[in-house]
Amino acid sequence: QSPIFGPQDVSSIEGNSVSITCYYPDTSVNRHTRKYWCRQGANGYCATLISSNGYLSKEYSGRASLINFPENSTFVINIAHLTQEDTGSYKCGLGTTNRGLFFDVSLEVSQVPEFPNDTHVYTKDIGRTVTIECRFKEGNAHSKKSLCKKRGEACEVVIDSTEYVDPSYKDRAILFMKGTSRDIFYVNISHLIPSDAGLYVCQAGEGPSADKNNADLQVLEPEPELLYKDLRSSVTFECDLGREVANDAKYLCRKNKETCDVIINTLGKRDPAFEGRILLTPRDDNGRFSVLITGLRKEDAGHYQCGAHSSGLPQEGWPVQAWQLFVNEESTIPNSRSVVKGVTGGSVAIVCPYNPKESSSLKYWCHWEADENGRCPVLVGTQALVQEGYEGRLALFDQPGSGAYTVILNQLTTQDSGFYWCLTDGDSRWRTTIELQVAEATKKPDLEVTPQNATAVIGETFTISCHYPCKFYSQEKYWCKWSNDGCHILPSHDEGARQSSVSCDQSSQIVSMTLNPVKKEDEGWYWCGVKEGQVYGETTAIYVAVEERTRGSPHINPTDANARAKDAPEEEAMESSVREDENKANLDPRLFADEREIQNAGDQAQENRASGNAGSAGGQSGSSK
């Protein structure tokens, strides 16, 4: 399939102009190569009419231009003074010959329609309302008023002042006068449908003294807006149907021959093919809404339509907006795993690609939720604190310059199964969707920490060991201390007299962490993990409680926070060993000014990131960089 895309079907009227936009993949070669517009000729040859090299055929002399917009990866062909001779089959394309990459375009130029004298032309979109104005003289002020539609030679009454309404206009047509006006009546026709188009005659009075007005009604199908998107990227359909449908259910559907199949609506319907990768977001009280689809697939290409109706389904005579989506398979977005599998108690490391040109952008990870129209609350981000319920088991590792960041989630439970999105505050195309599937564990985890009930005593030495299997022998082992802004790898042995140290006993495949001497702020979550370069692997977590050993009082163990991962995976509560009012950050709302569907990460200001009262009784250390 050619990666060039444009309008399949262009229609205009004699004497008018058209502007045709063609899209091409965003590459350096494409930006600079020749662009052309040619017409399908005899023997299948496509003869150039205009090109970016400066060629202009004599048929187009003085009436056409071709402009390249490399920053948008588009070029535009403008043709003026159209004649019916221009009706035909064309191609817009790229390359040194006209056999290269191209897109077929049909151009239809119609005759200027001929109407009787004094015909008022009304042009309205499908689903909208037209108000036809009918003037009359004072002599017909008390006479019968009517509107009829021309069908051949006959004129069939649509509505009249005796309250007759043609059945096909029932509940759609009204005839009325405004205020004290004595020389004009109006007919409103609402919920316009294509078959309403045609010539109407309004009349006041009968016989030769009747006043007549001609009105031509044109009912327009929505012109689809073209959207050119890369495979695996995302697309947003912005739908603005007007205030008159603000309170009706909204939908987005995909055209399928004669029907339009609903993908999502505000009544809770959602096509399973879009599960985990779609969000519908109301924009304001005027009926504006947007639909975001991530992880675009080849089969997502096609014609889409948004609309509003109380049923949440497409309905003839209701306003719609249309798009044609083209999915370019020559994508710059790398192919990444769409399904990641884990087991209860285990961990997953999810690699999130982002635009390498935007390494300083803020990175986020959110959990797609199916309720209502779909939403994606942020769980962790480079400047967003970890959401409640994920403390000690979720961290984001940025790898600047690599074009990817890694999100690690451990102490997995089956409730973690679902869809997650990787996103940044930069290039919105680089959103990826991952489905996490968590199955019940059938064997012991690869990494095991001893002792499992970890309580360290202030001032003493505390060692904790992480046992790993031989398959991890060649990988780098590490311990890190989890905090709300990541998991900071602990320094090696020689990096400070009082620092935590890491050493590895290769013979018994153990990596140990020693705290010497233990301080109150050492309390918290620690992770043992393996990695190869910047590729993170398995992790396991342990909560280290710190207490003061007081003489003469019995030693009371704090609640074992590690039970959450081991014995009671579903349990969310942690008692005195972790402060319950852990600070969280609000995402800057400007990051997602057009993407309110991604929920903010917390309920407190970003400035409160570092935890206060470090070292207070029962408080968690606010260890931050």
Epitope: Q8, D9, R39, Q40, G41, A42, N43, G44, Y45, A47, S57, K58, E59, E85, T87, G88, S89, D104, V105, S106, E108
Partner: nanobody, 119 residues
């Protein structure tokens, strides 16, 4: 040179159906657009339907939803399926093929086939 041969005209009742066919021969490979026009009593020749080389079809408002234009894989034969016929559809139907020579548009016409719709 393009030759167009029409078939399928005849008499039909109002509400009934007919199918017209048009086969192109000669330099048919260069056909740009193919379709049908009609001449009804007392009127000039008017556009009915056409199909472009990218399979886009256009119809006159008066036949939209009732007539369907299709063509064969080799693109040399077009068929006009006419349903829900009305007396107003009575007339001579002409097949049209348009070729663009590289500098000018040439329209080729069939001989015409009579369609009569009785009420």
């Amino acid at each position: 040179q393009v030759q167009l041969v029409e078939s399928g005209g005849g008499l039909a009742q109002a509400g009934g159906s007919l199918t017209l066919s048009c086969a192109a021969s000669g330099t048919a490979a260069g056909i740009d657009v193919m379709g049908w026009y009609r001449q009804t009593p007392g009127n000039s020749r008017e556009f009915v339907a056409r199909i472009f080389s990218n399979d886009v079809t256009h119809y006159a408002d008066s036949v939209t939803g009732r007539f369907t234009l299709s063509r064969t894989q080799d693109k040399n034969t077009v068929s006009l399926q006419m349903n829900s016929l009305k007396p107003d559809d009575t007339g001579v139907y002409y097949c049209n093929a348009r070729i663009w020579t590289g500098s000018t548009t040439v329209d080729y016409w069939g001989q015409g086939t009579q369609v009569t719709v009785s009420s």
